[in-house]
């Protein structure tokens, strides 16, 4: 297993609709054809997997149908979008990239993006 540098923004504020997008960029040492991207969430020392996708270079990322993540790839960049976020989902989202094929296997883990999520203010009751 060889190490690889992964860069991602330090802080992102999700939209009022609970959507956060960020770019995860990796310094590919070779010509990988198969890449796996995993998003991990770290909150209060607990690390959980949010979503993962394996893709062939030049093709779209395919997450599971029920995944809260979508993404696109361009060269050594992956543009990740996480949807359906609420204030309780605020935390550090870490991008993990694995170059699966061809060998050698490379692994890179970013420093994480702190995603802040603000629940929208409830609408005041109206007399209609």
């Amino acid at each position: 297993c060889k190490a690889m540098h992964v860069a991602q923004p330090a802080v992102v504020l999700a939209s009022s609709r609970g959507i956060a997008s960020f770019v995860c960029e990796y310094a590919s040492p070779g010509k990988a054809t198969e890449v796996r991207v995993t998003v991990l969430r770290q909150a209060d020392s607990q690390v959980t997997e949010v979503c993962a996708a394996t893709y062939m270079m030049g093709n779209e990322l395919t997450f599971l149908d029920d995944s809260i993540c979508t993404g696109t790839s361009s060269g050594n960049q992956v543009n990740l979008t996480i949807q359906g976020l609420r204030a309780m989902d605020t935390g550090l989202y870490i991008c993990k990239v694995e170059l699966m094929y061809p060998p050698p296997y490379y692994l890179g883990i970013g420093n994480g993006t702190q995603i802040y999520v603000i629940d929208p203010e409830p609408c005041p009751d109206s007399d209609f």
Partner: antibody, heavy 118, light 108 residues
Framework: QVQLVQSGAEVKKPGASVKVSCKAS????????ISWVRQAPGQGLEWMGW????????NYAQKLQGRVTMTTDTSTSTAYMELRSLRSDDTAVYYC???????????WGQGTMVTVSS | EIVLTQSPGTLSLSPGERATLSCRAS???????LAWYQQKPGQAPRLLIY???SRATGIPDRFSGSGSGTDFTLTISRLEPEDFAVYYC?????????FGPGTKVDIK
Amino acid sequence: QVQLVQSGAEVKKPGASVKVSCKASGYTFTNYGISWVRQAPGQGLEWMGWISAYNGNTNYAQKLQGRVTMTTDTSTSTAYMELRSLRSDDTAVYYCARVAGYDAFDIWGQGTMVTVSS
Amino acid sequence: EIVLTQSPGTLSLSPGERATLSCRASQSGSSSYLAWYQQKPGQAPRLLIYGASSRATGIPDRFSGSGSGTDFTLTISRLEPEDFAVYYCQQYGSSPFTFGPGTKVDIK
């Protein structure tokens, strides 16, 4: 080195608006957020809100909602805070600070004194 | 909104003494997202501690932070003349990012 440099002191009349700038250097501006904090004379720190320089999304303190607007110009790595309908109790030193996620507000500007007086 | 309470309001000590400052949160949020700042007259605040216990770059090891949940402490092991200032705690785990009212450490 990493720093935030703010615009100079302002004197405004009640009802007017003020726009304070905060120029960042020494780091990738869009990777972080910028928060604004004010301090009235002899008082503590009051958080006003922040903007994610990555996507321009904003979050304001409830008491200032509707009066404050925070923006960024990524081409010049500058953040702006505009406060409208100024009142005498808006007289304060206004600080910008870098929002660094887990690393808190790690870099602060030198402060901008805004005086509201008729 | 998480409300932070700091105690005491003022702490009068002599150089060389140990200072213990307390910060209590009204509710337990992301407990590790607590910071301490130092502010001297006419200056901007300076980050001392983030993540409840991690020292910021360039901060001397006489400053230490501890605590979790709703109770946090900033300890200055041996006060130096330059440590006499106002200290603020802040929670930044959820919006709004509230500050405590501050503790003034002055010379006895």
